[in-house]
């Protein structure tokens, strides 16, 4: 089976031949806090089943196919950063202050 955050793109009998990063970010991706640059921050990984399995910048992700025109997959690399969260240990995100 594929690791969390991955999906089986090509599977053979009872096994996965090729795992790829899950191409659509979950809705609950974590937005970088404004004060992240000023202090070290630790994010606790959410419980299993709630993690945003995600490739934050899908090359071939597209905007919603539904009728809502307001949603967008555009990612502003300066304003809002989404971070994939692993399912194992908490992740310490330290900042250099840049």
């Amino acid at each position: 089976e594929c690791r969390p955050g991955m999906i089986c793109a090509t599977s053979a009998t009872n096994s996965c031949a090729r795992c790829v990063p899950y191409p659509i970010c979950a809705a609950e991706t974590v937005t970088k806090p404004q004060d992240m640059a000023e202090k070290d921050t630790t994010f606790e990984a959410p419980p299993l089943g709630t993690q945003p399995d995600c490739n934050p910048t899908p090359e071939n992700g597209e905007a919603p196919a539904s009728t809502s025109p307001t949603q967008s997959l555009l990612v502003d690399s300066q304003a809002s950063k989404t971070l994939p969260i692993p399912t194992s240990a908490p992740v310490a995100l330290s900042s250099t202050g840049k």
Partner: nanobody, 121 residues
Framework: QVQLVESGGGSVQAGETLRLSCTAS????????MAWYRQAPGNECELVSI???????YYTDSVKGRFTASQDNAKNTVSLYLKSLQPEDTAVYYC???????????????WGPGTQVTVSS
């Protein structure tokens, strides 16, 4: 219990179009992502498309620009519009619920019996 039923397959000539539909019971489409997989005879199962609960879509490179996934949450239906079909698109097409969480056998997700698409040149 999750049940998925695909429909809309058929035999067409190269360049023609089809619309596949997947109707679900036992859950609602405002929850898990839905995926379309396909499997040609003697081949491995291939991820074709994913559509998220809020309508975001992904397509594998070989179908990008030709296939379009959509959903109708009110009718608990997802669709895959196949245009400019090629002989290499010939396969059984399956829709799958929550493909991240349910990976077993030849395809990932809770899936239906599939619908056959045959494209002749």
């Amino acid at each position: 219990q999750v049940q998925l039923v695909e429909s809309g397959g058929g035999s067409v000539q190269a360049g023609e179009t089809l619309r596949l539909s997947c109707t679900a019971s036992g859950f609602t489409f405002d929850g898990p992502d839905m995926a379309w997989y396909r499997q040609a005879p003697g081949n491995e199962c291939e991820l074709v498309s994913i559509i998220s609960a809020d309508g975001r879509t992904y397509y594998t490179d070989s179908v990008k620009g030709r296939f379009t996934a959509s959903q109708d949450n009110a009718k608990n239906t997802v669709s895959l519009y196949l245009k400019s079909l090629q002989p290499e698109d010939t396969a059984v097409y399956y829709c799958a619920a929550d493909p991240r969480r349910n990976c077993r056998g030849n395809c990932c997700g809770n899936w239906g019996p599939g619908t056959q698409v045959t494209v002749s040149s």
